[in-house]
């Protein structure tokens, strides 16, 4: 899915109002020095691509994130604020139902959620290399794209 035409400000608002708090709850008890972020993103559509992948695609050692509260809220936000996103997720939803039903918090999952927090930070505040323009946010009319 191409996240270019999402309403980034609305997704950011959804993240800050609830999703971020759910991520913090999930990570509670974890030392802030424990995980180094290795996944990065360069602009908002790229960040959402990486966020989707880490949130919904099962990985070795962490198959259950898609059933977490933050994941369900992420899915809802993308479905509402990204045109046509829901249609692309039908197969993914069926695959998710086949995934392990129990929610297990492994160290690998904690590491993955730490990566997610980093990706969301960059989504909220992309740090673009300066090349002439120093703006780093899309305009409120949302259809202006970053140029590199």
């Amino acid at each position: 899915y191409d996240f270019t035409n999402c309403d980034f400000e609305k997704i950011k608002a959804a993240y800050l109002s609830t999703i971020s708090k759910d991520l913090i709850t999930y990570m509670s008890g974890t030392k802030s020095t424990e995980f180094n972020n290795t996944v990065s993103c360069s602009n908002r559509p790229h960040c959402l691509t990486e966020i989707q992948s880490l949130t919904f695609n099962p990985t070795a050692g962490c198959a259950s994130l898609a059933k977490e509260m933050f994941a369900m809220k992420t899915k809802a936000a993308l479905a509402i604020w990204c045109p046509g996103y829901s249609e692309t997720q039908i197969n993914a939803t069926q695959a998710m139902k086949k995934a392990r039903k129990s929610k297990v918090t492994t160290n690998k999952c904690l590491e993955q959620v730490s990566q997610l927090q980093g990706l969301w930070r960059r989504f909220n505040r992309p740090l673009l290399k300066q090349q002439g323009s120093s703006d780093y946010k899309d305009d409120d009319d949302k259809h202006h794209h970053h140029h590199h």
Epitope: S20, F35, Q117
Partner: antibody, heavy 119, light 107 residues
Framework: QVQLQQSGAELVRPGTSVKVSCKAS????????IEWVKQRPGQGLEWIGV????????NYNENFKGKATLTADKSSSTAYIELSRLTSEDSAVYFC????????????WGQGTTLTVSS | SIVMTQTPKFLLVSAGDRVTISCKAS??????VTWYQQKPGQSPKLLIY???NHYTGVPDRFTGSGYGTDFTFTISSVQAEDLAVYFC?????????FGAGTKLELK
């Protein structure tokens, strides 16, 4: 706990350069942006720029391009600001700060480094 | 650059007063406004982020509101320890910019 410890006060001559350090502890240094802010005596806050310690990416306030250079050393979890061609206008307190967990504010600040430029 | 015009510059207050500080952006900054408190000789402290969200441990008497270009910071009942300078900041566009500050002083 998260801490940002800045280097001590500096008294320097006009035309010279100075490098101020900001040592981070209590969190994964490469996960969060480090910001630099200038405050002249009795004045407001002026954003200088930001660095991503993970990859060295920076963004500068145009007013400080050619004046400030931001770097970070992952091995020592330390961020630096180098100020060049110093004049009396550069006399100020310089703060480093860390972005918060959401990327929308500065949650931890260094204690500030006072720079005095005088002949 | 986006200019953040903060008013008033000074406020004379008594304990228990309700205080309101205004911050106007020269162009829309959506909800990307933060409020900081700074006491003499100290670093700024984060109070409110993304217009109205309380930072950890910040008392409920501090609140923020607004959207677009007009923002308000309120202290519902001023305490002695609230005497400080308060700054708004926009982080919607580079360069990030701050308001000039509002100093709270005792009447």
């Amino acid at each position: 706990q998260v801490q940002l410890q800045q280097s001590g006060a500096e008294l320097v001559r006009p035309g010279t350069s100075v490098k101020v350090s900001c040592k981070a502890s209590g969190y994964a240094f490469t996960n969060y942006l480090i910001e630099w802010v200038k405050q002249r005596p009795g004045q407001g806050l002026e954003w200088i720029g930001v660095i991503d310690p993970g990859n060295g990416d920076t963004n500068y306030n145009e007013n400080f391009k050619g004046k400030a250079t931001l770097t970070a050393d992952k091995s020592s979890s330390t961020a630096y600001i180098e100020l060049s061609r110093l004049t009396s206008e550069d006399s100020a307190v310089y703060f480093c700060a860390r972005e918060d967990n959401t990327g929308t504010a500065f949650d931890y600040w260094g204690q500030g480094t006072t720079l005095t430029v005088s002949s | 650059s986006i200019v953040m015009t903060q008013t008033p510059k000074f406020l004379l207050v008594s304990a228990g007063d309700r205080v309101t500080i205004s911050c106007k952006a020269s162009q829309s900054v959506s909800s990307d406004v933060t409020w900081y408190q700074q006491k003499p000789g100290q670093s700024p402290k984060l109070l409110i982020y993304y217009v109205s969200n309380h930072y950890t441990g910040v008392p409920d008497r501090f609140t923020g509101s607004g959207y677009g270009t007009d923002f308000t910071f309120t202290i519902s009942s001023v305490q002695a320890e609230d005497l400080a300078v308060y700054f708004c900041q926009q982080h919607h566009r580079f360069p990030l910019t701050f308001g000039a500050g509002t100093k709270l002083e005792l009447k």
